[in-house]
């Protein structure tokens, strides 16, 4: 659990409290909100990050057509229940005993119900489509340069194995990044595509989760890439179960 030794902080998660309590005075850190120990050598799970975000005082469509089963996170923020490994629990409930099932990125995948609602398993989100619109530029970006830069970003900043970045599409001004990661592909120690996508989403919004690093400065051949709109679609290994009423709304 390597963290910056000089002042004991977590490089990959600023929403932590750290202490030099490890062997040899090594830094160890806990996520705010949950009090769960986190590994600062990799990304913190989205569930723990959302929980930390909710515990903090409140301060201040298409190149690839998303499948009919693609989910968009319309419900916004909530205070999630995380399992002992920091993953989302399959069933989430609010203070008023309204419950729903979520996928591995914490997005609702069923109608809301009561405490009797059953969510038998945490369904994995295996395909994430990040849809970006960039601000006007003098000309279009070179597609291969853009592709290389975004792949480098996910590899170096988010530590996501390159094989999980399936494709980068570009039709000015829309960029799409496809992340794919089946249960069978994800080895121990691999960053989850859901966590990488969440860190990227927060970076794009200027709300970096990294400790002490500057905000995201995306450049393609020196030209700033400024994003003005982001949409993220989530595809699960098992299609979501919504009533017809919602699907036709």
């Amino acid at each position: 659990h390597t963290a910056a030794q000089d002042n004991c902080t977590c490089p990959t998660n600023k929403m932590t409290v750290c202490s030099p309590d490890g062997p040899g005075g090594r830094c160890q850190c806990r996520a705010l909100g949950s009090g769960m120990a986190v590994d600062c050598s990799t990304l913190t799970s989205k569930c723990l990050l959302l929980k930390a975000r909710m515990s903090a005082p409140k301060n201040a469509r298409t190149l690839v057509r998303p499948s009919e089963h693609a989910l968009v996170d319309n419900d916004g923020l909530y205070d999630p229940d995380c399992d002992p490994e920091g993953r989302f629990k399959a069933r989430q409930c609010n203070q008023t005993s309204v419950c729903w099932c979520v996928n591995s990125v914490g997005v609702r995948r069923t109608d809301k119900g009561d405490l009797s609602l059953r969510c038998d398993e945490l369904v994995r989100t295996h395909h994430i489509l990040i849809d970006l619109r960039h601000r006007p530029t003098a000309g279009a970006f070179n597609h291969s340069d853009l592709d290389a830069e975004l792949r480098r970003l996910f590899r170096e900043r988010y530590r996501l194995h390159p094989k999980f970045v399936a494709a980068v599409h570009y039709e000015q001004p829309t960029i799409q990044i496809e992340l794919r990661q089946n249960t069978s592909q994800k080895a121990a120690g691999d960053v989850d595509i859901g966590d990488a996508a969440y860190y990227f989403e927060r970076d794009i919004k200027g709300e970096s989760l990294f400790q002490g690093r500057g905000g995201l400065d995306l450049r393609v051949r020196g030209e700033p890439l400024q994003v003005e709109r982001t949409l993220i679609y989530y595809l699960d290994e098992i299609p979501p179960k919504f009533s017809m009423k919602r699907l036709t709304a």
């Epitope: 002042n7 004991c8 409290v17 750290c18 202490s19 030099p20 309590d21 490890g22 062997p23 160890q28 806990r30 705010l32 949950s34 009090g35 769960m36 120990a37 002992p84 490994e85």
Partner: antibody
Framework: QVQLQQSGPGLVKPSQTLSLTCAIS??????????WNWIRQSPSRGLEWLGR?????????DYAVSVKSRITITPDTSKNQFSLRLNPVTPEDTAVYYC?????????WGQGTLVTVSS | DIQLTQSPSFLSASVGDRVTITCRAS??????LAWYQQKPGKAPKLLIY???TLQSGVPSRFSGSGSGTEFTLTISSLQPEDFATYYC?????????FGGGTKVEIK
């Protein structure tokens, strides 16, 4: 060598407030690397962590759910100490109360204070 | 909350014996476990942290091992001053929780 010295009454009436203080020597309550805890021990419940406070550019508190609605842990930087308030108390709160330093390991403990809740 | 179950609850042993105490966690806690020794009327004293790291000043006859859900504290050769109660503590997630204790008595 860090030393923690506890003080506070040993007898508290039901429905009243239990107040204990832990004076720190050899460290600072506002140290950005220390975490300060309260723990209690009783025959019925064993060792039970109650909560903690620590300073990391601002103060953070965490409490056990079992006492969350009744507990307050407060640092006092001027006296280099931190205190525990539990309100209201019942006879089930009768226990030996300890303060301790640490987060992933409690390496220094106070001497303990037996608090009896009785009318 | 994570439950810790210690076994045995009581243990009778003689000076020089090798003693092993087990602590089982209700969920995986990696190596986030500490061991404490407590004598009557005294505060607990840290022996082992991070499952196997010996706290400074603690005799080397104490050792800890394990990861995940099963942990052991071993005293290689029991000394007269080791007769006490031993507790494990998980430090992976709040609330931090303790085992029920193992009392080591003189046979």
């Amino acid at each position: 060598q860090v030393q923690l010295q506890q003080s506070g009454p040993g007898l508290v009436k039901p429905s009243q407030t239990l107040s204990l203080t832990c004076a720190i020597s050899g460290d600072s309550v506002s140290s950005t690397s220390a975490v300060w805890n309260w723990i209690r021990q009783s025959p019925s419940r064993g060792l039970e962590w109650l909560g903690r406070t620590c300073y990391r550019s601002k103060w953070y508190n965490d409490y056990a759910v079992s006492v969350k609605s009744r507990i307050t842990i407060t640092p006092d930087t001027s006296k280099n100490q931190f205190s525990l308030r539990l309100n209201p108390v019942t006879p089930e709160d009768t226990a030996v109360y300890y303060c301790a330093r640490g987060d992933f390991r409690f390496d220094s403990w106070g001497q303990g204070t037996l608090v009896t809740v009785s009318s | 909350d994570i439950q810790l179950t210690q076994s045995p609850s009581f243990l009778s042993a003689s000076v020089g014996d090798r003693v092993t105490i087990t602590c089982r966690a209700s969920q995986g806690i990696s190596s986030y476990l500490a061991w404490y020794q407590q004598k009557p009327g005294k505060a607990p004293k840290l022996l082992i942290y991070a499952a196997s790291t010996l706290q400074s000043g603690v005799p080397s006859r104490f050792s800890g091992s394990g990861s995940g859900t099963e942990f052991t504290l071993t005293i290689s050769s029991l000394q007269p001053e080791d007769f006490a109660t031993y507790y494990c503590q998980q430090v992976k997630i709040y609330p931090l929780t303790f085992g029920g204790g193992t009392k080591v008595e003189i046979k």
